[in-house]
């Protein structure tokens, strides 16, 4: 799968983790840090 | 599935404000950005600003820094863009514009008619 | 803000002829840049995204190209339902479109 970094737009899009873009998918998505979850990393899980 | 719904069309007069909703269904705004975008009869797209639905944080073009307001009603999955000091210009197209985990995805567009 | 100068702003060509539409962004867009089409009366349709993607059921005859600041969109093959105005869009900081190409038919 190629990645690369998202556009500068999305900065901020992912609250806890960093966003990156599947360029074979057309995706943004958000690679959450240990902890959180969901769609920009928005909850946070014990 | 996904739909952008805004709110039907306006004339307003100038000098008038105007309030355009889009109401989203099949997905959270919450995980979005909002766009806005209008078109002049017979012009070109031009983007006005968005919203960080989930931060209510936005940005605005600089052209209209001062004459736009875009909010979101998360309870309401609905986003709003109002534009005042209205003047015949602003007569277009106004669109609203998902953007966020997939490409942009359009709503159908509301026709505003600024006229004395 | 970011400014895209596309061109040309309108073009005649015949049925079958290779067409090609430039747009050239203000700074580095680092190949985030989206080709619309739009029919009058119509919202534009999204063709291609991040340089080259196609979008699903877009015809093939339709492709992007181009890094850095300078970016062009092909249709290889003009078809009479391609006649249309074309738009490109830089979506890496903030968003601008280009000023747009009218396609007609000669």
């Known amino acids: 799968v190629s990645i690369t970094k998202c556009n500068s737009d999305m900065n901020g899009y992912c609250l806890h983790g960093q966003c990156i873009y599947l360029v074979d998918m057309s995706q943004n998505y958000c690679r959450c840090e240990v902890g959180y979850t969901g769609v920009r990393c928005e909850h946070f899980y014990l | 599935q996904d739909q952008l719904v805004q709110s039907g069309a306006e004339v307003k007069k100038p000098g008038a404000s105007v309030k355009v909703s889009c109401k989203a269904s099949g997905f959270n705004i919450k995980d979005t950005y909002i766009q806005w975008v209008r078109q002049a009869p017979g012009q070109g797209l031009e983007w006005m600003g968005r919203?960080?639905?989930?931060?209510?944080?936005?940005k605005y073009r600089e052209k209209f820094e001062g004459r736009v307001t875009i909010t979101a009603d998360t309870s309401t999955n609905t986003a709003y863009m109002e534009l005042s000091s209205l003047r015949s210009e602003d007569t277009a197209v106004y669109y609203c514009?998902?953007?966020?985990?997939?490409?942009?995805?359009w709503g159908q567009g509301t026709l505003v008619t600024v006229s004395s | 803000d970011i400014q895209m100068t596309q061109s040309p702003s309108s073009l005649s060509a015949s049925v079958g002829d290779r067409v090609t539409i430039t747009c050239k962004a203000s700074q580095d867009i680092h190949k985030y840049i989206a080709w619309y089409q739009q029919k009058p009366g119509q919202a534009p349709r999204l063709l291609i995204q991040?340089?080259?993607t196609l979008q699903p059921g877009v015809p093939s005859r339709f492709s992007g190209s181009g890094s850095g600041t300078d970016y062009t969109f092909t249709i290889s093959s003009l078809q009479p339902e391609d006649i249309a105005t074309y738009y490109c869009l830089q979506y890496d900081n903030r968003r601008t479109f280009g000023g747009g190409t009218k396609v007609e038919i000669k």
């Open positions: 991040y340089t080259s």
């Open positions: 919203i960080d639905p989930l931060r209510h944080q936005t």
């Open positions: 514009v998902r953007s966020g985990r997939e490409f942009d995805f």
